[in-house]
């Protein structure tokens, strides 16, 4: 099993541009989670989906952030417009 697959691995963008992160969960997993990690703020849960439905997006109250899960095998996290403080490692995770 390839595990959770994210793309891109690295992203550099200018402030104000749109950024889209992609995730392919493990096949058969019905929960998907997006996290953000920075030195200053630690690990933050942004949103999670169960059976493609967003359950809790309270970790991303800024409407610059949006996430979708159109089907069981794909999710996107979009930031528009991006800001310097969005610089972080973004993790996608999935579970049964």
């Amino acid at each position: 099993d390839a595990g959770v697959i994210q793309s891109p691995r690295h992203e550099v963008t200018e402030m104000g541009q749109e950024v889209t992160l992609r995730c392919k969960p493990i096949s058969g997993h019905n929960s998907l989670f997006w996290y953000r990690q920075t030195m200053m703020r630690g690990l933050e849960l942004l949103i999670y989906f169960n059976n493609n439905v967003p359950i809790d997006d309270s970790g991303m109250p800024e409407d610059r952030f949006s996430a979708k899960m159109p089907n069981a095998s794909f999710s996107t996290l979009k930031i528009q417009p991006s800001e310097p403080r969005d610089s972080a490692v973004y993790f996608c995770a999935s579970s049964l």
Epitope: E44, D56, S58
Partner: antibody
Framework: EVQLVESGGGLVQPGGSLRLSCAAS????????MHWVRQAPGKGLEWVSY????????YYADTLKGRFTISRDNSKNTLYLQMNSLRAEDTAVYYC??????????WGQGTTVTVSS | DNQLTQSPSFLSASVGDRVTITCRAS?????IYWYQQKPGKAPKLLIY???NLAPGVPSRFSGSGSGNEYTLTISSLQPEDFATYYC?????????FGQGTKLEIK
């Protein structure tokens, strides 16, 4: 029916502390974000702080960082605001509000904080 | 911080009038949210995501706009609409409010 009930306000001297509480009912408190907003007498609304469902994401108004601390206890369906080093300009009605529709869809009735010697 | 400026700050109008309140942002925002507040009461959400009416809000209220400029329109003022109106942005923390527009009976 969604209900938010603030408590803990009162009269406090400059430099003092208060802890406000917001008791939530009528919805799944542990599944959503919560805000504090304040309104000084005769003035407009001022956003104070936000906390996500699991407390991993927290934001503060720049002017309040370091003095105010937001927290929550999901087992008690309660939101808190710890306010330290209080100043006269912190005198206001403090509201808790539920995050909903991307905004604040339900508000409490408010609790009054007066900072005066 | 993104500063929101509402105009006018005060507005006198009569029952049946059509009124428009403008909210201008110092930096572009994705959406604007509108609240109504009556004296001694908590604010009430009116419009979310720029143009969506909150549950129970009459259809005489509408919202529009994009970028830096947004509007709240009341098509035909009713006695219960006399209140103070606030815009707010959630595009970027801190989640600033406009200074408010007080709508008074002429």
């Amino acid at each position: 029916e969604v209900q938010l009930v603030e408590s803990g306000g009162g009269l406090v001297q400059p430099g003092g502390s208060l802890r406000l509480s917001c008791a939530a009912s009528g919805f799944t408190f542990s599944n959503g974000g919560m805000h504090w907003v304040r309104q000084a007498p005769g003035k407009g609304l001022e956003w104070v702080s936000y906390i996500s469902s699991g407390s991993s994401t927290i934001y503060y108004a720049d002017t309040l960082k370091g003095r105010f601390t937001i927290s929550r206890d999901n087992s008690k369906n309660t939101l808190y605001l710890q306010m330290n080093s209080l100043r006269a300009e912190d005198t206001a009605v403090y509201y808790c509000a539920r995050r909903g529709e991307g905004a604040m869809d339900y508000w409490g009735q408010g609790t009054t904080v007066t900072v005066s010697s | 911080d993104n500063q929101l400026t509402q105009s006018p700050s005060f507005l006198s109008a009569s029952v049946g009038d059509r009124v428009t309140i403008t909210c201008r942002a110092s930096s572009s925002v994705n959406y604007i949210y509108w609240y109504q507040q009556k004296p001694g009461k908590a604010p009430k959400l009116l419009i979310y995501y720029t143009s969506n009416l909150a549950p129970g809000v009459p259809s005489r209220f509408s919202g529009s706009g994009s970028g830096n400029e947004y509007t709240l329109t009341i098509s035909s003022l009713q006695p219960e609409d006399f209140a103070t109106y606030y815009c707010q942005q959630f595009t970027s923390s801190p989640f600033t409010f406009g200074q408010g527009t007080k709508l008074e009976i002429k």
